[in-house]
C-alpha cells in the first residue's frame, strides 16, 4: 500500500465497511499540515477532508464515512496546492472487520461453544484462540460463522480464550487486516475466572492472514 512518491508512506484501513482511514508518514513534511483531498468517483471534483487525524499537532491522516461502498478511493495529499502523493485504491482490499461483540461461552463436559454476533456482511472467518497454563502456544479454531465449538478440553484445567474476525482472502484478497482481539476471558470447570494461574501474558495478535 505504501507509496514512495516524495518519501510519502500511506496506509489505508477500511474499518468494518463503514469508515476509511488513510494515514501518511512523510518525513520531508513532518512539520507541515498536509491536506487530504478525495473522491469516490472518477468524474467528481475532489472534496477536502473534514476529519483529520493529528500527530504532534500536524495532520497525519483522514477519516472518511464510506458505508458499505464497493468503490475506488481517489485521493491526493497536498502541501498547499502542490500534490505530494496521488493515488487510487479499491477500498475493500483493506477491510478490517470490527472486533467480536457479545462473546458468549456455552460449556458441555469437555467442549465449549463460543458464539458472538455475526457481522452484517459475509465472507469472514471467526477465529477462537485458547490455551491453558500447560500449553506452550495458543491453539486455534475458526469457522465462517461466529459459532465455534472446541472439543477435547480438560474440565480441570483453566483456559484463556479470545476471539477475532478475519476477512477471507479468497474473497477480499491478501491485503486485509484481522480485527482486534476480544478481551481475554478465563474459564475453569465451566465457570469464569479472573485469570488462569501461571498463564503468561497473551502474545500480541498475530498479523498473519
Amino acid at each position: 500500500q505504501g507509496g514512495a512518491a516524495e518519501g510519502v508512506q500511506i496506509q489505508i484501513i477500511y474499518f468494518n465497511l463503514e469508515t476509511v482511514q488513510v494515514t501518511w508518514n512523510a518525513s520531508k513534511y513532518s512539520r507541515t499540515n498536509l491536506t487530504f483531498h478525495y473522491r469516490f468517483n472518477g468524474d467528481e471534483a475532489y472534496d477536502q477532508c473534514t476529519n483529520y487525524l493529528l500527530q504532534e499537532g500536524h495532520t497525519s491522516g483522514c477519516l472518511l464515512d464510506a458505508e458499505q461502498r464497493d468503490d475506488i478511493l481517489y485521493f491526493s495529499i497536498r502541501n498547499g496546492t502542490h500534490p505530494v502523493f496521488t493515488a487510487s485504491r479499491w477500498m475493500v482490499y483493506y477491510l478490517k472487520p470490527s472486533s467480536p461483540k457479545h462473546v458468549r461461552f456455552s460449556w458441555h463436559q469437555d467442549a465449549v461453544t463460543v458464539t458472538c454476533s455475526d457481522l452484517s456482511y459475509g465472507d469472514l472467518l471467526y477465529e477462537v484462540q485458547y490455551r491453558s497454563p500447560f500449553d506452550t502456544e495458543w491453539q486455534s479454531k475458526q469457522e465462517n460463522t461466529c459459532n465455534v465449538t472446541i472439543e477435547g478440553l480438560d474440565a480441570e484445567k483453566c483456559y484463556s480464550f479470545w476471539v477475532r474476525v478475519k476477512a477471507m482472502e479468497d474473497v477480499y484478497g491478501p491485503d486485509t487486516y484481522p480485527s482486534d482481539w476480544s478481551e481475554v476471558t478465563c474459564w475453569q470447570r465451566g465457570e469464569i475466572r479472573d485469570a488462569c494461574a501461571e498463564t503468561p501474558t497473551p502474545p500480541k495478535p498475530k498479523l498473519s492472514k
Partner: antibody, heavy 118, light 106 residues
Framework: QVQLQESGPGLVKPSETLSLTCAVS?????????WGWIRQPPGKGLEWIGR???????SYNPSLKRRVTISVDTSKNQFSLKLSSVTATDTAVYYC???????????WGQGTLVTVSS | EIVLTQSPATLSLSPGERATLSCRAS??????LAWYQQKPGQAPRLLIY???NRATGIPARFSGSGSGTDFTLTISSLEPEDFAVYYC????????FGGGTKVDIK
C-alpha cells in the same frame, strides 16, 4: 464445483436494453463472493463491466456506469446484467464469472454472444 | 484508467520451446496482476494471480514474475494444448485487461 451459465436474447435492437442472467450452480450466492460480468467483442480483447455482492452492493466500469445495472436474486441463485441504449459496439460475447481473491475471475461461464442489430 | 500493453502481439513457436510473454502497465499495479489463457470458442481460464501464484490445477510449466509495471508469463516448455491467446489483467484501480498475446505454432 461452482458452475455459471449465461442466458438471454442473442439479438437486441439498437437503442434497446440488453438483458442477461447468470445462473450459478454448485454454490449459494448468498454464502459469499462477488460476482461479475465481462464482455469480449468478436476478435477483440476483454472488458470488465461490473460486479455485485449478494447484499446488492455494486461496482461498475466507469466507462459503462451510466448504462449498466447489475442485480442479484439470491432466491433463484442468479445475478443479472442490464445494459441500456445499446449500439453496434456493444456486440460481444458476454461472460459471467465469480470474483476470486480480491478481483480475479474464476470460474467463468461459457459466454453468450449478443448481437446488436436492427 | 490503467492501460496494460502486451507484447508481442503474436509469438510463433514450436512445441517444447520456451515462451516468454510480456505485460507492461501504464502505472504501478504493485503485484495486482493475473494471467489468463483463452482457446477459440472458450472462456478464459485463470492461470496466475497476484503476479506469481499459480491457480489451482495449473501445471508447473506456467510461471509468472514481476511487480510494479513490468510482468512476465513464462511457459517453460510448450505443450500442444498451450497454443492459445494469453491476457493479463490488473486489479489495482478498477479492472482492465491487456490486448492479448497469441501463441501459435511455427
Amino acid at each position: 464445483q461452482v458452475q455459471l451459465q449465461e442466458s438471454g436474447p442473442g439479438l437486441v435492437k439498437p437503442s434497446e436494453t440488453l438483458s442477461l442472467t447468470c445462473a450459478v450452480s454448485g454454490y449459494s450466492i448468498s454464502s459469499g463472493y462477488y460476482w461479475g460480468w465481462i464482455r469480449q467483442p468478436p476478435g477483440k480483447g476483454l472488458e470488465w463491466i461490473g460486479r455485485i455482492y449478494h447484499s446488492g452492493t455494486t461496482s461498475y466500469n466507469p466507462s459503462l456506469k451510466r448504462r449498466v445495472t447489475i442485480s442479484v436474486d439470491t432466491s433463484k441463485n442468479q445475478f443479472s446484467l442490464k445494459l441500456s441504449s445499446v449500439t453496434a459496439t456493444d456486440t460481444a460475447v458476454y461472460y459471467c464469472a465469480r470474483n476470486w481473491g480480491g478481483n480475479w475471475f474464476d470460474p467463468w461461464g461459457q459466454g453468450t454472444l449478443v448481437t446488436v442489430s436492427s | 484508467e490503467i492501460v496494460l500493453t502486451q507484447s508481442p502481439a503474436t509469438l510463433s513457436l514450436s512445441p517444447g520451446e520456451r515462451a516468454t510473454l510480456s505485460c507492461r502497465a501504464s502505472q504501478s499495479v504493485s503485484s495486482y496482476l493475473a494471467w489468463y489463457q483463452q482457446k477459440p470458442g472458450q472462456a478464459p481460464r485463470l492461470l496466475i494471480y497476484d503476479a506469481s501464484n499459480r491457480a489451482t490445477g495449473i501445471p508447473a510449466r506456467f510461471s509468472g514474475s514481476g511487480s510494479g509495471t513490468d510482468f512476465t508469463l513464462t511457459i517453460s516448455s510448450l505443450e500442444p494444448e498451450d497454443f492459445a491467446v494469453y491476457y493479463c489483467q490488473q486489479r489495482s484501480t478498477w479492472l482492465t485487461f491487456g490486448g492479448g498475446t497469441k501463441v501459435d505454432i511455427k
